[in-house]
Interface confidence: low
């Protein structure tokens, strides 16, 4: 079924704990129809987390993302536009475990949904986790994203709504630069090969899929140092009917926390959008084998080209998240 503007595509029950801003690529607000207001933060790994908009760190994160987006725009870069009510801002991203997140296909009007959900064990393998939401629902991009670091998504544990794998099964969006209005966003699935970094000077003013984030719970933007070894992000996908809740407890138990429901609309007829860099604080690598999907800015629903074998996609994602 096609969700209207008023339909709540992402539902948050638990809010993530603080996530390093550097791990975030963009954010967006959930719909007013969701009742409980929340900010959906997307990490470089394309993990989605529910955050409380009233918390100062969330406000700071959004502001940071906004600044980064503005800075990139000034530098000729581009960033991913926020979708719907989302406002570009940067906040610490929490690497989270993927628990219940439902992606509901809308294109066909079918109610079936793809719900990627990593086991808590897998989530634990990730460096840090927090509630994540299905990818493709956030709006602003933030810092530069790692190619596809599996382990650098630092974030709250157990609150991750849904982590989109860097593989082609993940979805991200491309959009015009922040100053370029555009109603629709292309969702670009990330391939196992994370998007490549682009030279700011070569980036176009278009959005590209966000790069994976670091999974270190406390890590922020790309920093250089020697310390933790990269840890893969683990997530499992499973097919389910109906929305899947996403966990939002960032640094808590790996158990499910807040759940986010994301509607995903398969759009097999969609053209393949060009992969363009997103400017938002950092340069986001482009996905190599993006799944082209479009997102209706009026809703958080993500339209993703149908995957032939959802389970296979899940398996790929799961595999990708393990070293």
């Amino acid at each position: 079924q096609h969700h209207g503007v008023t339909k709540c595509n992402i539902t948050c029950s638990k809010m993530t704990s603080k996530i390093p801003v550097a791990l975030l690529i963009h954010y967006q607000q959930n719909q007013a129809s969701c009742g409980k207001r929340a900010i959906i933060l997307e990490t470089r790994q394309h993990r989605l987390f529910c955050a409380d908009p009233k918390e100062q760190w969330v406000k700071d994160a959004m502001q940071h993302l906004d600044r980064q987006a503005a800075a990139l725009t000034r530098n000729g870069g581009t960033f991913e536009k926020q979708i719907g009510e989302v406002k570009p801002r940067t906040t610490p991203a929490a690497g989270g475990m993927d628990e219940s997140v439902v992606l509901e296909p809308e294109a066909t009007g079918e109610s079936s949904s793809l719900e990627p959900t990593p086991s808590s064990q897998e989530a634990q393998r990730a460096l840090g986790t927090s509630p994540e939401l299905p990818t493709g629902v956030t709006g602003s991009s933030g810092t530069r994203l790692p190619p596809t670091p599996k382990a650098q998504d630092g974030g709250p544990v157990g609150t991750e709504l849904f982590r989109v794998p860097p593989v082609s099964t993940a979805a991200t969006w491309q959009s015009s630069a922040p100053h370029q209005p555009g109603p629709s966003l292309w969702a670009e699935a990330k391939t196992s090969e994370a998007p490549s970094t682009q030279d700011p000077s070569t980036q176009a003013s278009t959005a590209s899929s966000p790069a994976p984030e670091e999974n270190a719970p406390s890590e922020g933007q790309r920093v250089w140092g020697q310390g933790q070894s990269p840890r893969p992000e683990n997530s499992l996908e499973r097919e389910e009917m109906g929305p899947v809740p996403a966990h939002t407890d960032a640094f808590q138990d790996w158990g499910p926390g807040s759940m986010a429901h994301v509607s995903v609309v398969p759009v097999s007829s969609e053209g393949t959008p060009s992969r363009e860099p997103v400017a938002s604080g950092s340069w986001t690598p482009k996905a190599e084998e993006p799944i082209h999907a479009t997102m209706d800015p009026q809703r958080l629903g993500v339209l993703i080209t149908p995957v032939p074998d959802a389970q296979a996609a899940t398996r790929r994602q799961h595999h990708h998240h393990h070293h």
Partner: antibody, heavy 117, light 107 residues
Framework: EVQLQQSGPELVKPGASVKISCKAS????????MNWVKQSHGKSLEWIGD????????SYNQKFKGKATLTVDKSSSTAYMELRSLTSEDSAVYYC??????????WGQGTTLTVSS | DIVMTQSHKFMSTSVGDRVSITCKAS??????VAWYQQKPGQSPKLLIY???TRHTGVPDRFTGSGSGTDYTLTISSVQAEDLALYYC?????????FGGGTKLEIK
């Protein structure tokens, strides 16, 4: 254990080119950007650029465009930086450093490049 | 490019003392600041990122603070092994730039 093993010291003549290698181990090579940083003798650090091992996408510090070229060989988990048209100003210690974010998490031991006739 | 300025090239302190190393950015970097320690003959080592997040394995005597354009690395109780060069780096936007470094000397 994450390790970034760089090639040995280089002594080259002005005008020549040199290719420094950095072999990564202890983590999934394609999961992290590989950065290159220059440290001239007695001076600070300069970020040269980075490369996404997945597709080889690069981002350079404008100052080093035309001077440095970053590449990777995924099969061997090795990153390379080629420096061309060398001058004495290029004499320095060059570090490869992996990162998942905009700060570096792991550094190689450094490769000393000496440009002298 | 964003310029990171570490006003003190050298700082002399004694073991057990509290010392603060400062860094100023030419523009607001939204706490996207990292601190690295480089001991003689070694590669830099990440201490702090995102202004105040301590990297794994870094002793808790090292703390970072700051916002906007002003950032500080504080060593609450200096140890002999802390003798090193300390660099700040903005990881807010590319090209990522470093401060000139502050050499901490032990009296």
């Amino acid at each position: 254990e994450v390790q970034l093993q760089q090639s040995g010291p280089e002594l080259v003549k002005p005008g020549a080119s040199v290719k420094i290698s950095c072999k990564a181990s202890g983590y999934t090579f394609t999961d992290y950007y590989m950065n290159w940083v220059k440290q001239s003798h007695g001076k600070s650090l300069e970020w040269i650029g980075d490369i996404n091992p997945n597709q080889g996408g690069t981002s350079y510090n404008q100052k080093f465009k035309g001077k440095a070229t970053l590449t990777v060989d995924k099969s061997s988990s090795t990153a390379y930086m080629e420096l061309r048209s060398l001058t004495s100003e290029d004499s320095a210690v060059y570090y490869c450093a992996s990162s998942g974010n905009s700060y570096v998490d792991y550094w190689g031991q450094g490769t000393t490049l000496t440009v002298s006739s | 490019d964003i310029v990171m300025t570490q006003s003190h090239k050298f700082m002399s302190t004694s073991v057990g003392d509290r010392v603060s190393i400062t860094c100023k950015a030419s523009q607001d970097v939204s706490t996207a600041v990292a601190w690295y320690q480089q001991k003689p003959g070694q590669s830099p080592k990440l201490l702090i990122y995102w202004a105040s997040t301590r990297h794994t394995g870094v002793p808790d005597r090292f703390t970072g603070s700051g916002s906007g354009t002003d950032y500080t690395l504080t060593i609450s109780s200096v140890q002999a092994e802390d003798l090193a060069l300390y660099y700040c780096q903005q990881h807010y936007s590319s090209p990522y730039t470093f401060g000139g470094g502050t050499k901490l000397e032990i009296k």
